[in-house]
């Protein structure tokens, strides 16, 4: 199994993947296979009303850039006081013995997975964006008795959560064949999107490709600047009883998804007032309604908030509300 896979995003369309070679490979590693698939945003995000008081916006951050090798090692130091000067203690004989046993177990366990759990691929061709080969089928675990898998950092039989897009083993997924290196830049990805990346080490190219159990890692691309900006005009329609219907276009390709809109409006000479429009409310009337406005000149600005944060405010839109009897100063949603 490839060790310590780490992924970071350095742009809104790329993820850099790095890993270390297996500690005890079965034969020579000839190449690595990297598969990736886009993960859907959690369905809860589409349902929740993030305008509700006390409901925090979901925390979605992209995978930050790598630190230098030295600083990584420094951060991973097992024992470190506040001065940061300490090094790890020398290993005892029993620790060394234990590590040798673990290494031996990992090798034996990987052999077992190769021979029992997986059916080898028959052919391998190309490194295109689409995988033309039949994916290796997993045999039913019923065939191999009770197996307890406990390998750190490796999800041999991952559970699919509601956040991931289910992909059947037969489906074509983008992949890359990596030869003579332990890194890959995955390009052409969607901005501020989560990806699940699968990494396998292979020790035979043809005719039968033999690859390790997969190591998995997740990463999110960086946000795209301006992707959350409302494009096009904010339009309005004035109805009876001084009801003003404000309408605007949802950003076409937002960072993740738009969770709410902020409407900021003010009558000339008055203080600014705010209205929060949730996803659902926007969908119902492609905007919002201001009700019972006092007569006068108004300006309105709107901005979208996505999983990555706020977009820019729109240019102000202006409208005039004529005199109308019985008008409490108010707003309709």
């Amino acid at each position: 199994v490839p060790l310590d896979p780490i992924s970071v995003s350095n742009s809104s369309s790329q993820i850099i993947l790095k890993w270390k070679p297996p500690s005890d490979p079965n034969g020579n590693i000839t190449h690595y296979l990297v598969f990736w698939e886009r993960q859907a945003e959690d369905s809860e995000l589409f349902e929740l009303d993030y305008c509700l008081k006390g409901l925090k916006l979901p925390s979605r951050t992209w995978s930050p850039p790598f630190e230098s090798e030295d600083s990584q090692k420094h951060n991973q130091s097992e024992y470190e006081d506040s001065a940061g000067e300490c090094c790890s203690c020398p290993k005892t004989d029993s620790q060394i013995l234990k590590e040798l046993e673990e290494s031996s177990f990992r090798k034996t366990f990987e052999d077992y997975l190769h021979n029992v759990v997986f059916v080898p691929r028959k052919t391998s061709s190309g490194t295109g964006a689409e995988d033309p080969r039949p994916s290796r089928k997993r045999r039913s675990l019923g065939d191999v008795g009770n197996v307890t898998v406990a390998v750190p950092t490796v999800a041999a039989f991952p559970n699919t959560s509601s956040t991931s897009v289910p992909t059947s083993p037969e489906e074509h997924r983008p992949f890359e064949k990596v030869v003579n290196k332990e890194s890959l830049v995955i390009s052409g990805l969607r901005h501020f999107t989560g990806y699940r990346i699968e990494l396998q080490a292979c020790n035979q190219d043809t005719p039968e490709e033999r690859c390790s159990v997969a190591a998995y890692v997740s990463a999110r691309t960086m946000p795209e600047a301006k992707a959350d900006d409302i494009v096009g005009p904010v339009t309005h329609e004035i109805f009876e009883n001084n009801v003003v219907h404000l309408m605007w276009q949802e950003p076409k390709e937002p960072n993740g998804l738009i969770v709410l809109y902020e409407v900021s409006y003010r009558r000339y000479g008055d203080e600014e007032l705010h209205l929060c429009v949730s996803r659902k409310h926007f969908a119902l009337e492609r905007g919002c309604r201001l009700r019972g406005l006092s007569p006068g000149n108004y300006s309105v600005r709107i901005r979208a908030t996505s999983l990555a944060g706020n977009g820019s405010w729109t240019e102000p839109t202006y409208f005039y509300v004529t005199d109308y009897l019985d008008v409490p100063s108010n707003i309709a949603k």
């Epitope: 009303d49 305008c51 109805f239 949730s278 969908a283 009337e285 707003i331 949603k333």
Partner: antibody, heavy 118, light 112 residues
């Protein structure tokens, strides 16, 4: 003047279907989301379903999800509620109402009675 | 769902006297933008509901000024300063802060 007129109610056996209509006039129907709200005999009001101005977004109360379908025809200024697999507990007066979400519903129809009984 | 509890269930009032109906929500109805989406509806016998008050205290056009709404957070009140014969019916509170909107059980106002 805003007017909403419901039709299509009646007596129906459990498990059967019924389709309610709501004809709208006096306002720009295609600009408004629309709701169905019901009231069981001698009981309170219960929100049933809502449809967006264009018909592309629909939401339902858990009690009717999978059985009722809300739809609209903006060219005919008409709202519909297709009710399948009706149960005794669906017996109620059904109202269509114009959307003003945070402010409840600013205009209501006169209602149409649905009785589910064997 | 947010539960709306109204009291009393029944309210017998003498013509010309004041009336007060209480509505309590199971959660605060203050929305993230600071607005409180609490409405009052009147349903006269044999008629459909009609909105009287929106956002706690704002009267709809055409609603007599003897009707007033007040309250905040989870406690709200509808007051009729002098009850008239045409006020007979059932009064419902309804919250629009949380999806889906939910109604109180209703208060039946009748003349003594």
């Amino acid at each position: 003047e805003v007017q909403l007129v419901e039709t299509g109610g009646g007596v129906v056996q459990p498990g059967r279907s019924l389709r309610l209509s709501c004809a709208a006039s006096g306002f720009t129907f295609s600009s408004y989301a629309m709701h169905w709200v019901r009231q069981a005999p001698g009981k309170g009001l219960e929100w049933v379903a809502v449809i967006s101005y264009s018909g592309s977004n629909k939401y339902y109360a858990d009690s009717v999800k999978g059985r009722f379908t809300i739809s609209r025809d903006n060219s005919k200024n008409t709202l519909y509620l297709q009710m399948n697999s009706l149960r005794a507990e669906d017996t109620a007066v059904y109202y269509c109402a114009r959307h003003e979400w945070g402010f409840g519903f600013d205009y209501w129809g006169q209602g149409t009675t649905v009785t589910v009984s064997s | 769902d947010v539960v709306m509890t109204q009291s009393p269930l029944s309210l017998p009032v003498t013509l010309g006297q004041p009336a007060s109906i209480s509505c309590r929500s199971s959660q605060s109805l203050v929305y993230g933008d600071g607005n409180t989406y609490l409405n009052w509806f009147q349903q006269r016998p044999g008629q459909s509901p009609r909105r009287l008050i929106y956002k706690v205290s704002n009267r709809d056009s055409g609603v007599p000024d003897r009707f007033s709404g007040s309250g905040s957070g989870t406690e709200f009140t509808l007051k009729i300063s002098r009850v008239e014969a045409e006020d007979v019916g059932v009064y419902f509170c309804m919250q629009g802060t949380y999806w889906p909107g939910t109604f109180g059980g209703g208060t039946k106002l009748e003349i003594k």
